[in-house]
């Protein structure tokens, strides 16, 4: 048993049929010695008397708020949550496996630049009675500070018969140098509580590996005289790290016809302009990627050819 | 990434082209190592991230873009221990910090070159003959060092009398390649920045 926060404790249980459970000793936080009784939740049934109460925790019915009283007055209380371990593996019932980039990916994180700011998100099909708390650090043995906000519900989607809820959190490394070479990864830890069930999820990454620039901005077309060619120009996204001559991007320019089956023409360039042939009803799209470290491409910025 | 490779203008900052080749070569070598050593801990998640230049050079600090010198977090350990001049320096305009920066890059390359050569000598003794260092990568390191043209004593190749542990050597190769790739990214950024300035 360990303390999650003031008066809230997590009991770790091996979860299998007829498991013996865990013996837990609760102590009433009071100088009183006599006349102390214990109850669970709203029930008036007395579970025991004395300054300590020993219980066998086996199932969710044994979790909840244990309260010690004296003469009708509440002295203290302890809320017990359960953390299930099945076949030696901690349960992951609360969050959905996103399976990207690999199986057992429950948390996904992205950064728009090298400032030390990043966003993580996760999915669940549970709509209520859910609490998340997020902590993060750089490294784990001698952790350096990363500050995370509160997790918020950022999207709701319907998937078949199920509704899916996306939660996200923004974190910022306390003292980040955009030019630094990372040798210790960022660790993100999410505590999830659904009713009286506790679970925890972790992710470890380098900012450089989760970079995904915003799409290029101000995408414009300039027709070239007496030609089907156009000059496409764009700019670095505002959110990208500066100076741009140090944090350089590379770009992919694509000409795509109306039908998905039509052949796509692609050009790669380090410049912020390119000359392409604009077909009728086609659209021109540009996306960006760090020029020197191949993390994710940005989403496409697009303009119609006409 | 299959990008069309642009050939630099002759008037262009001469080290930029070499640094681009360096990053390409080390990235290819790392990819080859990951594939060949698939049953070894060779991915970024599996290895310990060590920097053999730590406390010996200060490339990130010495080569910090002017715009980032206002950032307190970037100024933790600015050292000014390298004073020299080399052929990549753009004539008289070269600042003291730029000389320091390029000299630090040169020292990095020299240290990695020694490590890689020592390691290659060990790998050549492996009866499995599983992996060797790409000669192109070693040549590219050499070319960039020559372009930087700093005079410094040659460091003798480390030789060891004990029987090499090939498993450990291969893991160390992965660690070195990961670290060198990160440094090659920094070097490329620096050259791009200096070229633009």
């Amino acid at each position: 048993i360990w303390e999650l926060k003031k008066d809230v404790y997590v009991v770790e249980l091996d979860w299998y049929p007829d498991a013996p459970g865990e013996m837990v000793v609760l102590t009433c936080d009071t100088p009183e010695e006599d006349g102390i009784t214990w109850t669970l939740d709203q029930s008036s049934e007395v579970l025991g008397s004395g300054k300590t109460l020993t219980i066998q925790v086996k199932e969710f019915g044994d979790a909840g708020q244990y309260t010690c009283h004296k003469g009708g007055e509440v002295l203290s209380h302890s809320l017990l949550l359960l953390h299930k371990k099945e076949d030696g593996i901690w349960s992951t019932d609360i969050l959905k496996d996103q399976k990207e980039p690999k199986n057992k990916t429950f948390l996904r994180c992205e950064a728009k630049n090298y400032s030390g700011r990043f966003t993580c998100w996760w999915l669940t099909t549970i709509s209520t009675d859910l609490t998340f708390s997020v902590k993060s650090s750089r490294g784990s043995s001698d952790p350096q500070g990363v500050t995370c906000g509160a997790a918020t519900l950022s999207a709701e989607r319907v998937r078949g018969d199920n509704k899916e809820y996306e939660y996200s959190v923004e974190c910022q490394e306390d003292s980040a140098c955009p030019a630094a070479e990372e040798s210790l990864p960022i660790e993100v830890m999410v505590d999830a509580v659904h009713k009286l069930k506790y679970e925890n999820y972790t992710s470890s990454f380098f900012i450089r590996d989760i970079i995904k620039p915003d799409p290029p901005k101000n995408l414009q077309l300039k027709p070239l005289k007496n030609s089907r060619q156009v000059e496409v120009s764009w700019e670095y996204p505002d959110t990208w790290s500066t100076p741009h001559s140090y944090f350089s991007l590379t770009f992919c320019v694509q000409v795509q016809g109306k039908s998905k089956r039509e052949k796509k023409d692609r050009v790669f360039t380090d410049k912020t302009s390119a000359t392409v042939i604009c077909r009728k009803n086609a659209s021109i799209s540009v996306r960006a990627q760090d020029r020197y470290y191949s993390s994710s491409w940005s989403e496409w910025a697009s303009v119609p050819c006409s | 990434r299959n990008l069309p490779v642009a050939t630099p203008d002759p008037g262009m900052f001469p080290c930029l082209h070499h640094s681009q080749n360096l990053l390409r070569a080390v990235s290819n070598m790392l990819q080859k190592a990951r594939q060949t050593l698939e049953f070894y801990p060779c991915t970024s998640e599996e290895i310990d991230h060590e920097d053999i230049t730590k406390d010996k050079t200060s490339t990130v600090e010495a080569c910090l873009p002017l715009e980032l010198t206002k950032n307190e977090s970037c100024l933790n350990s600015r050292e000014t221990s390298f004073i020299t001049n080399g052929s990549c320096l753009a004539s008289r305009k070269t600042s003291f910090m730029m000389a320091l920066c390029l000299s630090s890059i040169y020292e990095d390359l020299k240290m990695y070159q020694v490590e890689f050569k020592t390691m290659n000598a060990k790998l050549l003794m492996d009866p499995k003959r599983q992996i060797f260092l790409d000669q192109n990568m070693l040549a590219v390191i050499d070319e960039l060092m020559q372009a930087l043209n700093f005079n410094s004593e040659t460091v003798p190749q480390k030789s060891s009398l004990e029987e090499p542990d090939f498993y450990k050597t291969k893991i160390k190769l992965c660690i070195l390649l990961h670290a060198f790739r990160i440094r090659a990214v920094t070097i490329d950024r620096v050259m791009s920045y200096l070229n633009a300035s």
Partner: nanobody, 119 residues
């Protein structure tokens, strides 16, 4: 049978305070997030504040810093302390467990308690 009984409403001047209370019975109270909702005439019912099983609280932007939600798992009560009240806080206030509404698919709503903020 699930029962929710709200009390504590009344007429108060702008800037004044009220404390609402809700007694819940007929279900196991502790695991559920409990919420306070309000409905002004001609408007949709909105969630004002909630408190989870582990006492994490959430507030609508319009009441942040003025309202405080708390719970007592022994008595099965949830309270809403409302300070610096404004005329736009005028509404009928209800308490409920969002999870209970979701699970049972039934609308368990109490009679609510009227709060009127007027000079």
């Amino acid at each position: 049978e699930v029962q929710l009984v709200e009390s504590g409403g009344g007429l108060v001047h702008p800037g004044g305070s009220l404390r609402l209370s809700c007694v819940a019975s007929g279900f196991r109270f502790t695991p559920y997030t409990m919420g306070w909702y309000r409905q002004a005439p001609g408007k949709q019912r909105e969630l004002v504040a909630s408190i989870s099983s582990v006492y994490s609280t959430n507030y609508a932007d319009s009441v942040k810093g003025r309202f405080t939600v708390s719970r007592d798992n022994v008595k099965g009560t949830v309270s809403l302390q409302m300070n610096s009240l404004k005329p736009e806080d005028t509404a009928v206030y209800y308490c409920n467990a969002p999870g209970l509404l979701h699970e049972e698919g039934t609308d368990y709503w109490g009679q609510g308690t009227q709060v009127t903020v007027s000079s």
